[in-house]
């Protein structure tokens, strides 16, 4: 048994059929030596007298709102939440696996570029009665500050007869050093909460991985004379890291029609332009990518041709 | 090149074949993400090389201010991996595929830093660690870490490159 | 599967005009950018230009503006390079090719060798 | 126009060795560059597009790497068929252009 917070534990238990569960002693926080008695929840029903309370905690009925009384006065509470363990596993049961990049992704960070800035969001099923709590760090040995805000509900969306909801946060390096090559990976560590049972998640990795820029900015077309050329010019987006010159993007641009089986202009480019062929009713899409490091494409960003 | 007393490399061929060493160390290992190698443990194995860290001046303004500094960590870092890439940890068993570019990254990692530091002139080098897994699985896992580590700085190394060609080429 | 097939040799004097047809089958005509381009004997391969069978919107190489025609028919799913005022120096083999990307070339033809000698 | 430069023009190499043949760019073309091989009597063959894009029903021997002026076609280990001429494209700008192609025969 271990604190998650003040009056909060977590009961880790071996979670498989007949398992003998955990014994936990709860002492009643009050300087009262007699008189004192324990409930469970809203139940009237006195479990135990005395300042502490023995307890076998084998299943979720165990688990809830232990409190201690006296004389119909409440003198303290402690809260028992359960962390299960099967075959060696812990339980995964309140986030969905998003299975992208690989299985087991539960968690899933994407940074607009090397500020130290980072969002992380993770997907369930749950709708009620569900707690998150985010803790990050820079190593884990020694480590590094990272400041995360609360975690919100993002987006909800249906998922065929299933209501999916996208929760997010925000993290911030507290002493980001963009120009430097990591040495040691972005740690995060997630508690979440649902109902009386506890789990927890992590993920581990450089920004350098998760960077996905925002999409170029400003498209603009000029058609060229006498041609079925069109020059197509863009910035860069506004959130990615400057000096551009040192924080340099490639791009990508394409035109096509509404369907991805159309045919198709591409180019490549280092620069903020490109002399492509448009076709009437197709779009050119410029995307970015950091220059010297293979992480994530930006989304597209695009014009139609007309 | 970095000479010694303090001139400039010449930024426009360094920032071409930094951009070279980016594209190979890709083409060595394209495979990020399919091995998460952080998962794999025994990380003092890649915790010894040199990484461009927050006070060795490669950000633009340190680039401004003095580069020497910054070229030589990057100069000590190109070396580093030249030695560790003609290692047996890449030469041992199991053999490279015939058509790897582990060859082509080994003499771009050499070229780029004869461009830094002409002959005659030594900055320090850092000692190389001995590496010497026995297994030849252990060995596959080292390369893989040692490749991913060297994408992330060669990527810092270009940065450089090509700010310095952008602002402080003469 | 997509294939493309090209009409025979054909020898020309200088002067003279050429016309290459290209068949196109395995796919939707319209579906395909195609590009002809040609190789003189013994030479290197040089691009000649585009057509969208779509709509035939083309685009030619600069050596051959002028001289060079492309069409398309969709009802028979074919290409044609009509190539004007022939001198000795276009005695080549024309390629035709299809791909859904514009910017090379996926499918070819089998080539048409075309002779230019008085 | 862009003008691509293949080198070598030839390149004599054993059966089971590997061969590396080279296409240089006058300016960045990124990875606008794509590899052909052409067999004597016959039309060229997609190998490799966007530089190191690897085309289905292309044996695995083939790669290519590279970015910007320098491209690189390896072959890792020539079979009898591979012997044939290889051409790169670049598709950075109109009018696209070959380089002027690389023989590899046998040694």
């Known amino acids: 048994i271990w604190e998650l917070k003040k009056d909060v534990y977590v009961v880790e238990l071996d979670w498989y059929p007949d398992a003998p569960g955990e014994m936990v002693v709860l002492t009643c926080d009050t300087p009262e030596e007699d008189g004192i008695t324990w409930t469970l929840d809203q139940s009237s029903e006195v479990l135990g007298s005395g300042k502490t309370l023995t307890i076998q905690v084998k299943e979720f009925g165990d688990a809830g709102q232990y409190t201690c009384h006296k004389g119909g006065e409440v003198l303290s509470h402690s809260l028992l939440l359960l962390h299960k363990k099967e075959d060696g596993i812990w339980s995964t049961d309140i986030l969905k696996d998003q299975k992208e990049p690989k299985n087991k992704t539960f968690l899933r960070c994407e940074a607009k570029n090397y500020s130290g800035r980072f969002t992380c969001w993770w997907l369930t099923t749950i709708s009620t009665d569900l707690t998150f709590s985010v803790k990050s760090s820079r190593g884990s040995s020694d480590p590094q500050g990272v400041t995360c805000g609360a975690a919100t509900l993002s987006a909800e969306r249906v998922r065929g007869d299933n209501k999916e909801y996208e929760y997010s946060v925000e993290c911030q390096e507290d002493s980001a050093c963009p120009a430097a090559e990591e040495s040691l990976p972005i740690e995060v560590m997630v508690d979440a909460v649902h109902k009386l049972k506890y789990e927890n998640y992590t993920s581990s990795f450089f920004i350098r991985d998760i960077i996905k820029p925002d999409p170029p900015k400003n498209l603009q077309l000029k058609p060229l004379k006498n041609s079925r050329q069109v020059e197509v010019s863009w910035e860069y987006p506004d959130t990615w890291s400057t000096p551009h010159s040192y924080f340099s993007l490639t791009f990508c641009v394409q035109v096509q029609g509404k369907s991805k089986r159309e045919k198709k202009d591409r180019v490549f480019t280092d620069k903020t332009s490109a002399t492509v062929i448009c076709r009437k009713n197709a779009s050119i899409s410029v995307r970015a990518q950091d220059r010297y490091y293979s992480s994530s494409w930006s989304e597209w960003a695009s014009v139609p041709c007309s | 090149r970095a000479v010694p007393g303090g001139s400039s490399p010449a930024w426009t061929q360094c920032q071409q074949l930094s951009q070279k060493l980016c594209t190979l160390a890709w083409s060595a290992h394209p495979l990020v993400g399919h091995m998460d190698l952080r998962e794999e443990g025994d990380e003092e194995t890649t915790n010894d090389v040199p990484h461009i860290q927050c006070g060795d001046g490669c950000d633009p303004q340190g680039l401004r201010d003095n580069s020497q500094f910054c070229l030589q960590r990057i100069h000590q870092g190109l070396i580093f991996y030249e030695k560790l890439l003609g290692s047996d940890i890449f030469t041992g068993e199991p053999s490279l595929l015939p058509d790897s570019p582990v060859g082509q990254l080994h003499a771009s990692l050499l070229g780029l830093s004869q461009l830094l530091q002409p002959e005659g002139h030594h900055w320090e080098t850092q000692q190389i660690p001995s590496l010497s897994p026995s297994q030849p699985w252990q060995r596959l896992l080292l390369r893989f870490k040692i490749l991913r580590s060297l994408q992330a700085f060669v990527a810092v190394a270009a940065r450089v490159f090509a700010h310095g060609a952008a602002t402080l080429s003469p | 599967q997509v294939q493309l097939v090209q009409s025979g040799a054909e020898v020309k004097k200088p002067g003279a005009s050429v016309k290459v047809s290209c068949k196109a089958s395995g796919y939707t005509f319209t579906d395909y950018y195609l590009h002809w381009v040609r190789q003189a004997p013994g030479q290197g391969l040089e691009w000649m230009g585009w057509?969208?069978?779509?709509?035939?919107?083309?685009e030619s190489a600069p050596k051959f503006q002028g001289r060079v025609t492309m069409t398309t028919d969709t009802s028979t799913s074919t290409a044609y390079m009509e190539l004007r005022s022939l001198r000795s120096d276009d005695t080549a083999v024309y390629y035709c090719n299809a791909n859904k990307e514009l910017r090379y070339f996926d499918v070819w033809g089998q080539g048409t060798m075309v002779t230019v000698s008085s | 126009e862009i003008v691509m430069t293949q080198s070598p023009a030839t390149l004599s190499v054993s059966p089971g060795e590997r061969a590396t043949l080279s296409c240089r760019a006058p300016?960045?073309?990124?990875?606008?560059l794509h590899w052909y091989q052409q067999k004597p009597g016959q039309a060229p063959r997609l190998l490799i597009y966007f530089a190191s894009q690897s085309i289905s029903g292309i044996p695995a021997r083939f790669s290519g790497s590279g970015s910007g002026t320098e491209f690189t076609l390896t072959i890792s280990s020539l079979q009898s068929e591979d012997f044939a001429v290889y051409y790169c494209?670049?598709?950075?700008?109109?009018?696209?252009?070959f380089g002027g192609g690389t023989k590899v025969e046998i040694k």
């Open positions: 300016q960045s073309i990124s990875i606008n």
């Open positions: 057509i969208d069978p779509e709509n035939g919107d083309t």
């Open positions: 494209q670049q598709s950075n700008s109109f009018p696209l252009t």
